[in-house]
């Protein structure tokens, strides 16, 4: 038999790691292996998540908490709780339906995930390009040429013929 110290609904007495077993006179049965209950008063235990294939275990399941997964090297997590693993690409690339593709001219990606984003248009902020952009890096904007009085800075402004953000190929 099972003794409890509660006059309430017997199920409210069941702590995390157990479930209120209606098939057995509402006793608090421990969660079976590979299942868990993270809060008290539960009528079932949830099945532990299994990190298989491209997923790997970051935190093991226990009777009171679910397993947590991350992704094997070469992949990264997407979605709440790492519900999906997506293939990594190199910096300067983005993942398409056909695989990893280089960023188009005028765009960059400085991570192994995500999409290529347009270079910053320095002229929109009234600035000039200090460092040209690449597939892997955004442009670096500097002060506008008008802000630079002679002798005030050693920075050489870029050639005026070039469009903002362009990188020599």
């Amino acid at each position: 038999f099972e003794r409890t110290r509660s006059l309430q609904d017997p199920c409210s007495n069941c702590p995390a790691g157990t479930f209120c077993d209606n098939n057995r006179n509402q006793i608090c049965s421990p969660c079976p292996p590979n299942s868990f209950s993270s809060a008290g008063g539960q009528r079932t235990c949830d099945i532990c998540r299994q990190c298989k294939g491209v997923f790997r275990t970051r935190k093991e399941c226990s009777s009171t908490s679910n397993a947590e997964c991350d992704c094997t090297p070469g992949f990264h997590c997407l979605g709440a709780g790492c519900s999906m693993c997506e293939q990594d690409c190199k910096q300067g690339q983005e993942l398409t339906k056909k695989g990893c593709k280089d960023c188009c001219f005028g765009t960059f990606n400085d991570q192994k995930r995500g999409i290529c984003r347009p270079w910053t248009n320095c002229s929109l902020d009234g600035k000039s390009v200090l460092v040209n952009g690449t597939k892997e890096r955004d442009v670096v904007c500097g002060p506008s040429p008008a802000d630079l009085s002679p002798g005030a800075s050693s920075v050489t402004p870029p050639a005026p013929a070039r469009e903002p953000g362009h990188s020599p190929q």
């Epitope: 007495n13 790691g17 421990p30 079976p32 292996p33």
Partner: antibody, heavy 122, light 108 residues
Framework: EVQLVESGGGRVQPGGSLRLSCAAS?????????PCWVRQAPGKGLEWIGC?????????YDAQWTKGRFTISRDNSKNTVYLQMNSLRAEDTATYYC?????????????WGQGTQVTVSS | IQMTQSPSSLSASVGDRVTITCQAS??????LAWYQQKPGKAPKLLIY???TLASGVPSRFSGSGSGTDFTLTISSLQPEDFATYYC???????????FGTGTKVTVL
């Protein structure tokens, strides 16, 4: 070192009481580790006495035959579990083992103490 | 829950295949453990969840079964395997953790 150490055994007269202790070291009792008591009379098999939830709740799981004579309790601050035995009889003479019932091992007893001897005799 | 083991004892030789059975009085799914005990020593967990080998246990030990009928098999008996073996239900509550009656394995 991960271990369980029982103490408190000895000789007691019929009708007497005894409290056994089981101190855990190297791990803490929790919702994943329930402390249990098992006994073995001389030349006989293993007999399950009961277990207590390893966390902060007082839920106990007891064998029917204990009939309230045996009570399991726990002191989390000392990481120790107790077996209070009352109205002892000659047939309670046995080696009493403390064991850890582990969720990770399908609630099997994956760690056992060395046992403490209880003799009920006048 | 009552657990009945058979045989209660058996004699065998090194290298023999040994099978011990355990029957539960009601279904316990796969919630069964097997232990080995040597004289004067505490039991040692061999198998849990009916068929999962405990850490450090040689692969010659295996378990099977579900529901009410379970089996422990030693594929090739070794000198250190002469001992008493117990099954235990790990189905908590209502006397759910009862041990089997034990099987003593001795040298033929």
């Amino acid at each position: 070192e991960v271990q369980l150490v029982e103490s408190g055994g000895g000789r007691v007269q019929p009708g007497g009481s005894l409290r056994l202790s089981c101190a855990a070291s190297g791990f803490s009792f929790s919702a994943n580790y329930y402390p249990c008591w098992v006994r073995q009379a001389p030349g006989k098999g293993l007999e399950w006495i009961g277990c207590i939830y390893g966390g902060s709740s007082d839920i106990t799981y007891d064998a029917q035959w204990t009939k309230g004579r045996f009570t399991i309790s726990r002191d989390n601050s000392k990481n120790t579990v107790y077996l209070q035995m009352n109205s002892l009889r000659a047939e309670d003479t046995a080696t009493y083992y403390c064991a850890r019932s582990a969720w990770y091992s399908g609630w099997g007893g994956d760690l056992w103490g060395q046992g403490t001897q209880v003799t009920v005799s006048s | 829950i009552q657990m009945t083991q058979s045989p209660s004892s058996l004699s065998a030789s090194v290298g023999d295949r040994v099978t011990i059975t355990c029957q539960a009085s009601q279904s316990i799914s796969n919630r069964l453990a097997w232990y080995q005990q040597k004289p004067g020593k505490a039991p040692k967990l061999l198998i849990y969840s009916a068929s999962t080998l405990a850490s450090g246990v040689p692969s010659r030990f295996s378990g099977s079964g579900s529901g009410t009928d379970f089996t422990l098999t030693i594929s090739s008996l070794q000198p250190e395997d002469f001992a008493t073996y117990y099954c235990q239900s790990t189905y908590y509550g209502n006397d759910g953790n009862a041990f089997g009656t034990g099987t003593k394995v001795t040298v033929l």
